[in-house]
């Protein structure tokens, strides 16, 4: 299983904030030096950006609005989870409700738990407001049980 911790979710309310045009998502801990084989822990994260308006552009990955917001959020998570275990995010999507962001975070197995994912994200809210002009609230984090490192059995592991 992706994590040894019990699967649970946490939810908090608070504010913090969007926008900049930064080149996307590479940092020193996101370096391209080869890494050892390891398991991966996945965490589902949902939050509101209350100072942005949802429109149909956020349903289309080819639009500038979608790509700029994804780039900002990707860069933001690199800043939040600077420790070596953060791999990146996955399957980001945007929903109505100002803008609701839903995504999956990937970490090297054993480097973080669901509580710390949420705590570190909440601690970054003020900086998110000043650096990216993103007002963040309604944060929810949960484990995603998925046997990423299991390679035996009758399935067809890729």
């Amino acid at each position: 299983t992706p994590t040894t911790l019990a699967s649970h979710s946490t939810k908090t309310d608070a504010s913090s904030t969007h926008h900049s045009s930064v080149p996307p998502l590479t940092s020193s801990n996101h370096s391209t030096s080869p890494q050892l084989s390891t398991g991966v822990s996945f965490f589902f994260l949902s939050f509101h950006i209350s100072n942005l308006q949802f429109n149909s552009s956020l349903e289309d990955p080819s639009t500038d609005y979608y790509q700029e917001l994804q780039r900002d959020i990707s860069e933001m998570f690199l800043q939040i989870y600077k420790q070596g275990g953060f791999l990146g995010l996955s399957n980001i999507k945007f929903r109505p409700g100002s803008v609701v962001v839903q995504l999956t975070l990937a970490f090297r197995e054993g480097t973080i738990n669901v509580h710390d994912v949420e705590t570190q994200f909440n601690q970054y809210k003020t900086e998110a407001a000043s650096r990216y002009n993103l007002t963040i609230s309604d944060v929810s984090v949960s484990d995603v049980p998925f046997p990423f490192s299991a390679q035996s059995g009758a399935g067809v592991p890729g």
Epitope: H30, S31, F42, F43, F44, G88, Q102, F148
Partner: antibody, heavy 118, light 107 residues
């Protein structure tokens, strides 16, 4: 332990609708963040991502095929379905499903070969 | 859609050779690139994700590197069992796209 198996008609004629089923075990599509993608590969050629369905029934499609694709799921039966309308010979391929908690694919089904032939 | 241009298409090799495959993205994808191996009649197998992370059980002769638009996949010492087709994939944004493949062949 994750397993996946695709099934389809094998052979169908041009202009017909292709219906594919992905049956899986080892994960649940009711889990937040989970999803399943369909990917296809014409014989001897490259891979083409087709569609993705999320746990909450949100859907994504390849823009080049969007008007012909329809993805759906039956969470309780651990199945995901893909329909492709108005098929022609260019749709002849092996069709794979893969779970997508990540946007890369550590697990694939064995694939099902679909041949479109008059 | 992001185009992944993969080269070369064919790569003649001998056992023990060091081989390199490159993939170039039509726009920046950060380090969101995966590499797969596919043998005839089999499904693709994940080797590398996030540009440089080896999947569980993948031998350390397989490595990946790169960021932004330019990515490299290397086999440090080719073994007979490595003869296969290799694909890159950008997993940054929908629609996920793959390179056209590189086939390793006996020299």
């Amino acid at each position: 332990q994750i397993t996946l198996k695709e099934s389809g008609p094998g052979i169908l004629q041009p202009s017909q609708t292709l219906s594919l089923t992905c049956s899986f075990s080892g994960f649940s599509l009711s889990t937040s963040g989970m999803g399943v993608s369909w990917i296809r590969q014409p014989s001897g050629k490259g891979l083409e991502w087709l569609s993705h369905i999320y746990w909450d029934d949100d859907k994504r499609y390849n823009p080049s095929l969007k008007s012909r694709l329809s993805i759906s799921k039956d969470t309780s039966r651990n199945q995901v379905f893909l329909k492709i309308t108005s098929v022609d010979t260019a749709d002849t391929a092996t069709y794979y499903c893969a779970p997508g908690v990540s946007s890369w694919f550590p697990y694939w089904g064995p694939g099902t070969l679909v041949t479109v032939s008059a | 859609s992001i185009v992944m241009t993969q080269t070369p298409k064919f790569l003649p090799v001998s056992a023990g050779d060091r081989v390199t495959v490159t993939c170039k993205a039509s726009q920046s994808v950060g380090n969101y690139v995966a590499w797969y191996q596919q043998k005839p009649g089999q499904s693709p197998k994940l080797l590398i994700y996030f540009a440089s992370n080896r999947y569980s059980g993948v031998p350390d002769r397989f490595t990946g590197s790169g960021s932004g638009t330019d990515f490299t996949f290397t086999i440090s010492s080719v073994q007979v069992e490595d003869l296969a087709v290799y694909f890159c994939q950008q997993h940054y944004i929908f629609p996920y796209t793959f390179g056209s493949g590189t086939k390793l062949e006996i020299k």
